[in-house]
Interface confidence: medium
């Protein structure tokens, strides 16, 4: 939004469509501009002339700030923005009056307002800035810290958030956030923040507050881990009933609605939101939560956040799940898929979060529990999120899932197919200032399948013998992963996001190395764990020379800024379950794969379990759906008329520029997973 | 606060079609679920429709599924109902109205409305 009085007169300009939404934690450029008419004003032959004076401030609902003014090349900035806000641009462009803010907070949404006045001419544009994303703290409900780096992660993943960068937690700290519990970061460093420190909370900081470390972490160290949850379609339902639900009829109840539980992410972006319930609901990891916004004393003990509903009086265990509550129910289109009957007992994923109370019906909340250690065993709160003084019930009955015996099932043969299998990996373009790895071989080795395998199923056997010219990791495998649109298009956490919905994680640069050093090689820039972006060269070329010229070795982008773009590196383990492959005559769209594999107590694989059944010593040369409606498959045993001389999973593209999925529409087998 | 001002409204024939527009004022429409809701002469107010945010999810009531297209643009910070096939029983004054995103408590729970505009389908 621009403003000046009229043409010819000062104006200022911000060319940015409003509004501008950021993540929580990133940093934030303003671009400002103004064109100034009028020669150098002066007020007197004898005065010097008057330069443009700068003003910025934000505008929120609550008051109007001054961040900074600048003139005759002076900037002074508000001594509360001093380290935060700057004028890159000023006064080397005086006429650029553009705005840089560092690690945005919650608290810096608002209006911005840039004005500029010169003499008695005045103009001003405006820009609204949301803020986007929450951080909150995540708990495994059996006890605390028991989540390993990877299980840290898809903690998260299942509750529609991704685990928290160190700058959205210091964000979130400076908005509030306090808590003394040790939890996993994306960056694999375990930290908590403390505004006011005590014993047990001092961590490497003594009595300072301040996000707490404990530097980076063995992956395999247990503690919580904190999510980021950005945005969401959607919205959350509050669906109550005078008897309340159990578990199963909440389920139920928000089906019948159109909708599904909410996830513990969703949640906790409604309550930002403004959400406020002082009757607690079932959540779809069988929690039980209720958000309070507004504090009063006999509904969560007077404090703000998100509340949970333990078993134990220690803040373990969930509610029995034939108690009754009201169901909280998640309508939009961006559902996160989570099995029906994910969230088992004892099992690995049970996960649920923090503090607090059993409130049933509004509640005083008499007695306290003493306050926790960094490991220890609770948690204290300042505005928002949260504290706790739970009044708990006697234990239930323990809650199992009895899972469903398997069906027998037999196929067809193979027949045979002509599909694109990926040539040698030919990527397309995408400039960066610096060399991007673009790898180009000669035309697209387009190769018809021929029908020579005949094997019905094929499940990947555990110890099979070591892949050729795999690398060497512990049980697991690295892989190069892009979605099918386009190269380069995944942000830091889409590319968390992405190696996660393929049942992987994403690889750590130690990962990749040992790849690298078992003769992985891959031209395509790709995201690792430290937010590094990496690539492994063992053949030096023109496109592929990186850091390194013509050495051998993983090529390194340094730590990038989250928003940048590239393809990322994915590391999965051993494989729980089978992966087998399924064929018919007339094959099978996406969408009846998909079908088929549920009708059979299975489910679509997703790439990281091909891979990693691969790994194992799967070999087809079929291509076949994958959950992400990806067409692959996995070449043990190279030949020539199948996939090339190397061994790998091959991907079939649209175009020959390797990008673009198969039209789900079309027909191909199908790889199954259970 | 919002403040909500629809306009479009009048007689048509049925068959035909309208564009219903409701203009928000306040800076941070974008934030907000909108959605219009009708009430008929001697009945009830009743939900129509519904949108997202950022516009990727719609809702509708079923007696409209298929004939009207709820649409936002927050670059002007107006909400649009498109209605095709109008019938009588569509006959009613419109109401826009806003409430936050992220969650609500029932389909009529808006914390800001319009004064409405009348639709009259009539031959």
């Known amino acids: 939004e621009e403003t000046s009085d009229h043409d010819n007169s000062l104006s200022v300009s911000i060319p940015e469509p409003s509004p501008m939404r950021v993540l929580l934690g990133s940093s934030l450029t303003i671009p400002c501009y103004f064109i100034d008419p009028m020669h150098p004003v002066t007020t007197a032959p004898s005065t010097a002339p008057l330069a443009p004076r700068i003003k910025w401030s934000r505008i929120t609902k609550e008051k109007e700030v001054v961040l900074l003014v600048a003139t005759e090349g002076q900037v002074r900035i508000n001594s509360a923005y001093q380290d935060k806000v700057s004028l890159p641009n000023y006064p080397a462009i005086p006429s650029d009056a553009t705005l840089e803010i560092q690690n945005l907070r919650s608290n810096d949404s608002g209006i911005y307002r840039c004005e500029v006045m010169h003499g008695i001419e005045d103009s001003e544009a405006t820009l609204e800035v949301v803020v986007k994303g929450i951080v909150f703290h995540y708990r495994a409900i059996s006890t605390r810290y028991t989540l390993d780096f990877d299980r840290a992660q898809r903690a998260c993943l299942q509750n529609s958030a991704i685990i928290a960068t160190p700058e959205q937690l210091q964000a979130a700290y400076e908005d509030g956030f306090h808590q003394c519990d040790a939890g996993w970061l994306a960056d694999q460093t375990v930290r908590y923040p403390i505004h006011t420190p005590r014993e047990g909370c001092y961590g490497d900081k003594d009595e300072f507050p301040g996000v707490r470390t404990y530097g980076i972490r063995d992956t395999n160290e247990t503690y919580d881990v904190y999510c980021f949850a950005e945005e969401m379609e959607g919205e959350v339902l509050y669906a109550t009933s005078p008897e309340k639900f159990t578990f199963q009829e909440a389920a139920n109840e928000c089906r019948r609605l159109g909708a599904r539980l909410a996830t513990t992410g969703q949640l906790y972006l409604a309550w930002q939101g403004g959400m406020d319930m002082c009757s607690a609901g079932w959540l779809a990891d069988r929690s039980v939560r209720y958000p309070i916004s507004k504090a009063r004393p006999n509904c969560g003990g007077n404090l703000l956040g998100v509340r949970t509903v333990y078993l134990h009086a220690n803040q373990t265990g969930y509610p029995d799940p034939s108690s009754r509550y009201d169901a909280i129910c998640y309508t939009g289109e961006d559902f996160v898929d989570i099995p029906e009957n994910f969230f088992g007992v004892g099992g690995e994923e049970d996960i649920t979060i923090q503090t607090v109370t059993w409130p049933d019906v509004e509640l005083p909340l008499p007695r306290n529990i003493t306050e926790g250690e960094a490991r220890g065993n609770v948690i204290l709160t300042v505005k928002p999120i949260f504290d706790l003084s739970p009044t708990a019930p006697e234990p239930e009955e323990p809650f199992t899932f009895v899972p469903e015996p398997e069906k027998p099932f037999t196929f067809a043969t193979d027949v045979g197919v002509t599909a694109f299998p990926e040539a040698e990996n030919r990527t397309g373009e995408a400039t960066r200032p610096w060399g991007v790895p673009e790898e180009s071989t000669p035309g697209p080795a387009f190769t018809a399948f021929t029908s020579e395998d005949h094997v019905v199923q094929v499940t990947a056997v555990p110890g099979a013998a070591e892949v050729p010219g795999q690398p060497r990791l512990p049980g697991g495998v690295v892989f190069h992963y892009r979605p099918g649109s386009a190269r380069y298009s995944l942000t830091f956490e889409e590319a968390q996001q992405a190696c996660l919905r393929t049942g992987a994680v994403i690889a750590s640069p130690e990962q990749l190395q040992a790849a690298y050093e078992a003769g992985y090689e891959q031209c395509d820039a790709g995201w690792l764990q430290d937010q590094t972006v990496r690539y492994p060269i063992v053949s030096p070329r023109t496109p592929c020379v990186g850091d390194k010229d013509s050495s051998p070795g993983v090529r390194t982008y340094g730590v990038r800024p989250p928003s940048e773009t590239y393809d990322v590196y994915c590391y999965v383990d051993k494989l729980e379950g089978e992966v087998f492959f399924i064929t018919r005559l007339e094959q099978f769209t996406f969408q009846e794969a998909l079908a088929f594999c549920e009708s059979h107590n299975a489910t679509l694989a997703s790439t990281g379990q091909l891979y990693a059944a691969w790994r194992q010593g799967l070999d087809k040369c079929y291509a076949g759906w994958l959950s992400d409606g990806s067409l692959r498959y996995p070449i043990v045993t190279p030949r020539p008329s199948c996939g090339g001389d190397k061994p790998g999973v091959r991907t079939v593209y649209l175009y020959p520029n390797q990008t673009g999925l198969p039209d789900p529409l079309s027909r191909h087998h199908v790889f199954c997973f259970r | 606060d919002v403040q909500l001002v629809e306009s479009g409204g009048g007689l048509v024939q049925p068959g035909g079609s309208l564009r219903l527009s409701c203009a928000a004022s306040?800076?941070?429409?974008?934030?907000?679920?909108m959605g219009w809701f009708r009430q008929a002469p001697g009945k009830e107010r009743e939900f129509v429709a519904a949108i997202s945010w950022s516009g990727g999810t719609t809702y509708y009531a079923d007696s409209v599924k298929g004939r009207f297209t709820i649409s936002r643009d927050n670059s002007k910070n107006t909400v649009y109902l498109q209605m095709n096939s109008l019938r009588p029983e569509d006959t009613a004054v419109y109401y826009c109205?806003?409430?936050?995103?992220?969650?609500?408590?029932?389909?009529?729970?808006?914390?800001?409305w319009g004064q409405g505009t009348l639709v009259t389908v009539s031959s």
């Open positions: 109205a806003a409430r936050p995103r992220y969650y609500y408590y029932s389909l009529y729970s808006y914390d800001y």
């Open positions: 306040g800076r941070t429409f974008s934030t907000y679920t």
